[in-house]
């Protein structure tokens, strides 16, 4: 790297991936291994990010961009740029101080992470409950009771068996 | 280049709660982990915790109970809360910046003492 | 938590002579990586810390190649080449390897 001979800062040449070393009188030297300067006119590389622990590597460090995080199966990024690896837990679970919990009843979790939630009120809507929740799955509404005619019933009957031989469409 | 300045009380009353605020210049406080730590009168380094721009933090587990770490992105700024300091809590506290999450401090302010007595 | 213990902790020198400083982990600190997560700062009289290695041997831009960290596993050495008069202070190790961070007692490194 030649040294730069700007009049107002010397350092203002050195490009990405360099930074202006003062104990080489202001030559612009390249970052050291595991650091990098992601714009010029830098007088320090930043070291790169660690992927460690839970954390894996989902970006390599280069001299010129730092490293990028994801977290390890089993787990999740919570927060801009992974900044924290959750644990995972199954569906119908939610992550509590104490590990994974099942839901309590009248609340489920379709997901492996997040919290809980209670199960649709059909009511409110005006509506009736045509599939009852899980731990896993909401309730599914169905139309109200009025929208029924006389000897209905509110739940669907089961599908008739398909035939042998045919695949669904 | 990035810049760091402690602020806050000097003095603090026993069972009171210790506050301070880190200004970041020269520098965004996005996509960085930010910590504090302390060095009492004469003695060595403790790292007390960190927090992440988008608000996760990790706090050491021996003052877990105690301490309070938050960010303001908005005014490039992170705060440190002590509750129930003793005269043991008197130290000079720095923040600094910390390139993986608890290692690499390359960037830190210049401390500010706190002195717990009555 | 990993103790990190420094010997000396009080290292007189005469300028121009070498110096070198040990310190040891209670536990690993080499990673599935192949990194080594050890730092070492240097404290100047009224100053705050300053990193000067990083990964166990990596220096950080802008220190003076006069200084090196060499080391694996748990035990790790900082050396001074030829030491200078704005050297002194007080030098930590620390391991980056598991939260919470954790530092030596420090090693002063004072001018004969």
């Known amino acids: 790297f030649e040294r730069t001979r700007s009049l107002q800062d010397p350092c203002s040449n050195c490009p990405a991936g360099t930074f202006c070393d003062n104990n080489r009188n202001q030559i612009c030297s390249p970052c050291p291994p595991n650091s990098f300067s992601s714009a010029g006119g830098q007088r320090t590389c930043d070291i790169c990010r660690q992927c460690k622990g839970v954390f894996r590597t989902r970006k390599e460090c280069s001299s010129t961009s730092n490293a990028e995080c994801d977290c390890t199966p089993g787990f999740h990024c919570l927060g801009a740029g992974c900044s924290m690896c959750e644990q995972d837990c199954k569906q119908g679970q939610e992550l509590t101080k104490k590990g994974c919990k099942d839901c309590c009843f009248g609340t489920f979790n379709d997901q492996k992470r997040g919290i809980c939630r209670p199960w649709t009120n059909c009511s409110l809507d005006g509506k009736s409950v045509l599939v009852n929740g899980t731990k896993e799955r909401d309730v599914v509404c169905g139309p109200s009771p009025a929208d029924l005619s006389p000897g209905a019933s509110s739940v669907t009957p089961p599908a008739p068996a398909r035939e042998p031989g045919h695949s669904p469409q | 280049q990035v810049q760091l300045q402690e602020s806050g009380p000097g003095l603090v009353k026993p069972s009171e709660t210790l506050s301070l605020t880190c200004t970041v210049s020269?520098?965004?406080?996005?996509?960085?982990?930010w910590s504090w730590i302390r060095q009492p009168p004469g003695k060595g380094l403790e790292w007390m915790g960190y927090i992440y721009y988008s608000g996760s933090t990790n706090i050491n587990p021996s003052l877990k109970s105690r301490v309070t770490i938050s960010v303001d992105t908005s005014k490039n700024q992170f705060s440190l809360k002590l509750s129930s300091v003793t005269a043991a809590d008197t130290a000079v506290y720095y923040c600094?910046?910390?390139?993986?999450?608890?290692?690499?401090?390359?960037?830190w302010g210049q401390g500010t003492l706190v002195t717990v007595s009555s | 938590e990993i103790v990190m213990t420094q010997s000396p902790l009080s290292l007189p020198v005469t300028p121009g002579e070498p110096a070198s400083i040990s310190c040891r982990s209670s536990q690993s600190l080499l990673y599935s990586n192949g990194y080594n997560h050890l730092d070492w700062y240097l404290q100047k009289p009224g100053q705050s810390p300053q990193l000067l290695i990083y990964l166990g041997s990596n220096r950080a831009s802008g220190v003076p190649d006069r200084f090196s960290g060499s080391g694996s596993g748990t035990d790790f050495t900082l050396k001074i080449s030829r030491v200078e008069a704005e050297d002194v202070g007080v030098y930590y190790c620390?391991?980056?390897?598991?939260?919470?961070?954790?530092f030596g007692q420090g090693t002063k490194l004072e001018i004969k």
């Open positions: 600094a910046r910390d390139q993986s999450g608890g290692g690499s401090f390359q960037h």
């Open positions: 020269g520098g965004s406080i996005s996509s960085y982990y």
């Open positions: 620390m391991q980056a390897l598991q939260t919470p961070p954790t």
